[in-house]
């Protein structure tokens, strides 16, 4: 007996689709070996139609796929647009040849069954409405008109022209005529449910001269659309319910046994499991909306339904759309921590992954806000200036080519705690979600700047030093000048680098920056930070104010602006690896600078972590507190 298992018999009708699941034993070899679907011929040969190696036969082109779910030890063959030619014997199996482990599957595709010629078929989706057309002869114009639903023995009245209405159709059924046409009456039934499906008879007149018409009403539950997404990626449910529900509250829910638990609706309800990683976006006045979920988890797999009702909850007889979401654990999106921890006054460096094939894409960082329908306004981007309230404490460092860009936020306050998204204007799957937690600082900061009263005098020389602990000895130290387009790295001098590498004197580890001579343009925010290669660590910020010099001080000739930031001591002790590195200029707002557009961006997601040592502190919190408070509180 084969250890592979699946459905022995699959039956469907022309034009439909099938989704065949094959189960295999839980072994590492099985999870990684080739999976195939082949058709058995009369000779006993089995011809491959599709395989996990990427092979797709001509007859399946554009209508079939094979997806492996190693975490479930299953693979799924989806085949669409079935024809009777697809009827036959097949095998689903594992192995390098089609003689490996396999399971026999019989597929039968039938013609769509035909109804008697005098029956008019109406096919409608749940929640929609139907208008049944009932023709009659002119002589029956004055007679009673009616619609009844056939049961086993009789025909139960739905509605008639004397305004009699079956209790289960009150408020849903209307009998009417159009204009002056005395040869047709109509019955409209709204908010259709499964129970409305069946055979109906419309009638005008009584006895043998009565006009009768048979009607077959089919009420369909929407076929779930199959969505296959990678772990940590994102999914967008595009819901199009029609103009008739444009003004109703919208929802997305997830099937749970018999109920459908609301995940989010436009009335402000949101499942806590989706906090920080979900947005609902009304698209237009035609009842269209979308729900974006990022950071997909294994447990997000399941059956989803969107709908509309004034309550914001699922209601029978209202239009719905459904999806079956599969989450594949074989993901291209790197696994990172979803929570980053910082301390008040400190900093965090967040490594944001992006598709390495799209290094030139625009990078952004936004803060998820749960109020209303949820939105994510951009705070910084490669072509979006830093938002004003983040002046001096937020920068994006793009590292083209390595699949990561870094966002640094310093001078942390407890108000910074929350959810943030990394995103690009490229591959939408790579949107990542990160939760920032900020605790009260309980120790001295790792990086401290002196002097703390940072006021430089115009035309004079001004040096600031950044003290760092021995644990940062082997890391690169840098100073950069912050602007709302990034943080431009300056030449600096590392005093600690001159010491013997055997010992480390905690008191003398410092990296200094000198402004000589000081000019008015030197005023602003400066950061001192550490990094290891392309991995950024802690930073601290200081605001340097520039004042006119008092009378009697010596005059210094102004020098070229590019030479103002000078090395403190001998040229050869400067760490050349951090001199004159500049991140890209980002002059104008990008496509996601607008909150509305962030809500509408497509499909993707993922959890994230910070690089470097989270929980550093802001060494200039005392020296420039007035400036800090002015900007951030």
């Amino acid at each position: 007996k084969s250890p592979i298992f699946g459905p022995q018999e699959v039956s469907s009708i022309e034009g439909d689709s099938v989704s065949i699941t094959c189960y295999y034993p839980d072994t590492s070899v099985n999870r990684h070996t080739r999976k195939y679907w082949c058709r058995q011929g009369a000779s006993g040969m089995c011809t491959t139609l599709i395989s996990s190696n990427g092979y797709l036969s001509k007859e399946y082109s554009g209508r079939a796929n094979l997806i492996n779910f190693p975490e479930n030890n299953t693979f799924v063959i989806n085949i669409e647009q079935l024809t009777q030619d697809d009827t036959g014997s097949y095998k689903c199996g594992l192995g390098t040849s089609n003689r490996g482990l396999s399971f026999d599957v019989s597929l039968e595709v039938s013609q769509v069954p035909e109804l008697p010629s005098d029956t008019h078929v109406y096919t409608k989706d749940i929640g929609r409405n139907v208008t049944i057309e009932c023709p009659f002869k002119r002589e029956n114009a004055p007679s009673k008109k009616s619609l009844c639903k056939k049961t086993n023995q009789s025909c139960e009245l739905v509605i008639d022209s004397t305004e009699k209405v079956n209790p289960s159709y009150i408020g849903r059924a209307k009998l009417f005529m159009k204009g002056t046409d005395l040869t047709v009456f109509y019955v409209n039934i709204s908010h259709l449910t499964h129970n409305d499906a069946g055979l109906y008879i419309c009638q005008a007149g009584e006895g043998p001269s009565a006009d009768k018409k048979n009607v077959d009403l089919q009420v369909l539950a929407p076929e779930p659309e199959l969505l296959y997404k990678d772990l940590r990626s994102s999914v967008t449910f595009e819901c199009d319910l029609g103009r008739e529900v444009a003004n109703e509250a919208k929802y997305l829910c997830r099937m749970n046994k018999e109920t459908c638990d609301v995940i989010i609706n436009t009335l402000g309800k949101r499942d806590p499991d989706f906090e920080g990683r979900i947005l609902i976006t009304p698209k237009d006045d035609n009842g269209r909306f979308s729900v974006l979920i990022t950071g997909l988890r294994k447990e997000d797999a399941g059956h989803y339904q969107c709908g509309a009702h004034s309550s914001g909850l699922p209601q029978e007889g209202w239009p719905i759309q459904t999806w079956q979401l599969f989450v594949n654990e074989e993901s291209t999106i790197p696994n990172r921590r979803s929570v980053v921890k910082g301390v008040t006054g400190g900093s965090v460096a967040i490594a944001c992954p992006y598709n390495p094939k799209e290094s030139s894409s625009l990078k952004y960082w936004c803060r998820w806000e749960g109020d209303g329908n949820g939105h994510c306004p951009v705070l910084v981007g490669t072509q979006a200036q830093v938002q004003e309230e983040y002046e001096g404490r937020l920068a994006l460092f793009d590292q083209p080519g390595n699949g990561t860009y870094t966002v640094i936020l310093n001078q942390l306050t407890t108000e910074d705690a929350g959810f943030y998204w990394c995103l690009t204007n490229g591959d939408s799957r790579w949107r990542t979600t990160i939760e920032l937690q900020v605790a009260e600082a309980t120790r001295e900061p790792n990086l401290e700047v002196t002097p703390q009263n940072a006021t430089a005098v115009l035309g004079e020389t001004f040096t600031v030093s950044c003290h760092y602990p021995c644990k940062f000895y082997s890391q690169e130290k840098y100073w950069c000048k912050w602007s709302n387009k990034g943080c431009h790295i300056l030449p600096s001098h590392d005093e600690g680098a001159r010491q013997s590498s055997v010992s480390c004197d905690q008191s003398s580890q410092l990296v200094s920056m000198t402004l000589n001579p000081v000019s008015k343009e030197d005023e602003g925010w400066y950061w001192c930070g550490v990094k290891q290669g392309q991995t950024y660590g802690e930073t601290t910020a200081i605001y340097i104010a520039v004042e006119e010099r008092t009378r009697g001080s010596s005059h210094v000739n102004p020098t070229d602006a590019n030479a103002r930031a000078k090395v403190a001591l001998e040229e050869e002790v400067v760490d050349s690896s951090i001199s004159e590195k500049e991140n890209k200029a980002i002059p104008n707002p990008g496509p996601f600078a607008n909150e509305r557009e962030i809500q509408n961006v497509g499909d993707q997601a993922q959890e994230n972590r910070a690089s470097g040592d989270a929980g550093s502190a802001d060494g200039q919190s005392r020296s420039s507190s007035s400036k800090h408070h002015h900007h951030h509180h």
Epitope: S19, N72, A221
Partner: nanobody
Framework: QVQLVESGGGLVQAGDSLRLSCAAS????????MGWFRQAPGKEREFVTT??????????YYADSVKGRFTISRDNAKNTVYLQMNSLKPDDTAVYYC?????????????????WGQGTQVTVSS
């Protein structure tokens, strides 16, 4: 809730046939699959067959021990699933349980099913 009621069990000779029915009532539109399990005295409940559906497509799964002898079918209008058992053997003696599920990851696993009937006894004498 979904209620399941089995019928059609009884005592038959080896080689005979029997047809079991399972009628579902309640919120049946939420069900996605129905099937049969059996339990012989002193043994664990074992998978026999299941039918799942999506629109007009049906998928039928059988245990190796009943393949070719048992057939599962359903009447959508009556919310009923049938198990046609041919060429019965004494080994088929057991209590047969009908089960229904709203979501099925693996049809062979009893814990995947949300609703169960009370069971109907099938005895095959030699």
């Amino acid at each position: 809730q979904v209620q399941l009621v089995e019928s059609g069990g009884g005592l038959v000779q080896a080689g005979d046939s029997l047809r079991l029915s399972c009628a579902a009532s309640g919120r049946t539109r939420t069900t996605y699959g129905m099937g049969w399990f059996r339990q012989a005295p002193g043994k664990e409940r074992e998978f026999v067959t299941t039918i799942t559906w999506s629109g007009s497509t049906n998928y039928k799964y059988y245990a190796d021990s009943v393949k070719g002898r048992f057939t599962i079918s359903r009447d959508n209008a009556k919310n009923t699933v049938y198990l046609q058992m041919n060429s019965l053997k004494p080994d088929d003696t057991a209590v047969y349980y009908c089960a229904a599920s709203t979501v099925l990851t693996d049809p062979r696993v009893p814990t995947e099913y949300d609703y169960w009937g009370q069971g109907t006894q099938v005895t095959v004498s030699s």
